[in-house]
Interface confidence: low
Amino acid sequence: TCEIVTLDRDSSQPRRTIARQTARCACRKGQIAGTTRARPACVDARIIKTKQWCDMLPCLEGEGCDLLINRSGWTCTQPGGRIKTTTVS
């Protein structure tokens, strides 16, 4: 089970919205807070350790997931071509 703790939005840059979200999850042993289908979820801890973010299925159904080149996050590409970038900190 997960709950969103904080959600900050910054729309000051044209054509770009930056959102910072923190979630708190109660996960079983071997799992850790992550993102599945664009919502906070408990995921296999090995995914976080290896930074194979797309293995969490972080994007919505029908979107394409791609790792950022230095594995600092992932992108979700919508069928129309719009790209949402998520970085992990």
């Epitope: 930074k51 394409g64 791609d66 790792l67 950022l68 080149i69 230095n70 594995r71 600092s72 996050g73 992108t75 590409t77 790209i83 970038t85 970085t87």
Partner: antibody, heavy 115, light 110 residues
């Protein structure tokens, strides 16, 4: 190690396939990129093939260049509709899956397109 | 399309000087940048990846820094053997930006 082969003199419009042969590591766990360099010019990224065989290309290379894995030790670059602008040394390089770094390069193979 | 603007195109330095080469990306590349050294008739060799991670075997006088769109390769105490052309390579996602090289910087040692 990485070694390219197949470079030669061809006439415009001719298709050509280059081969990259690797040893000492596995294509099932490493990314491979193709990069080219025209005489006296800078480097130009062509595209990449993932261990899963997913491929991505530079926008200018889409449609005319195709990267494929032909065995556990070889990757090919198929080029069609070659023009004199494609004259270059073609390099194959192992790309780290942790960053954009290409940490092992072949010596390159020269492709000359001329009528 | 991602553009990597590399400056200066060429520079001349004396042994022991500090050399800085800058690459400016046309959009945020999330530290997805690497730096290469190339000598005539040789393939490039990787110096730095992930903006600041020094490749094994590369002398510590080479360092990388930067974030967002602005990145720098620094050679502290340049040596005669550092005469070469240096390239940055940037991109954050193969599917969206792919990778783009900077135009290169030719470093001459006086």
């Amino acid at each position: 190690s990485v070694e390219e082969s197949g470079g030669r003199l061809v006439t415009p419009g001719t298709p050509l396939t280059l081969t990259c042969t690797v040893s000492g590591f596995s294509l099932s766990s490493d990314y491979m990129s193709w990069v080219r360099q025209a005489p006296g010019e800078g480097l130009e990224w062509i595209g990449i093939i993932y261990p899963s065989t997913t491929t991505y290309y530079a926008s200018w290379a889409k449609g005319r260049f195709t990267i494929s894995k032909t065995s556990s030790t070889t990757v090919e670059l198929k080029m069609t509709s070659l023009t004199t602008e494609d004259t270059a040394t073609y390099f194959c390089a192992r790309g780290s899956n942790w960053s954009s770094g290409m940490n092992l390069w072949g010596p390159g193979t020269l492709v000359t397109v001329s009528s | 399309e991602l553009v990597m603007t590399q400056t200066p195109p060429s520079l001349s330095a004396s042994v022991g000087e500090t050399v800085r080469i800058r690459c400016l990306a046309s959009e945020d590349i999330y530290s997805g940048i690497s730096w290469y050294q190339q000598k005539p008739e040789k393939p490039p060799t990787l110096l730095i990846s992930g903006a600041s991670n020094l490749e094994s075997g590369v002398p510590p006088r080479f360092s990388g820094s930067g974030s967002g769109t602005d990145y720098t390769l620094t050679i502290g105490g340049v040596q005669a053997e550092d005469a070469a052309t240096y390239y940055c390579l940037g991109g954050y996602s193969y599917s969206s930006t792919g990778l783009t090289f900077g135009a290169g910087t030719n470093v001459e040692i006086k």
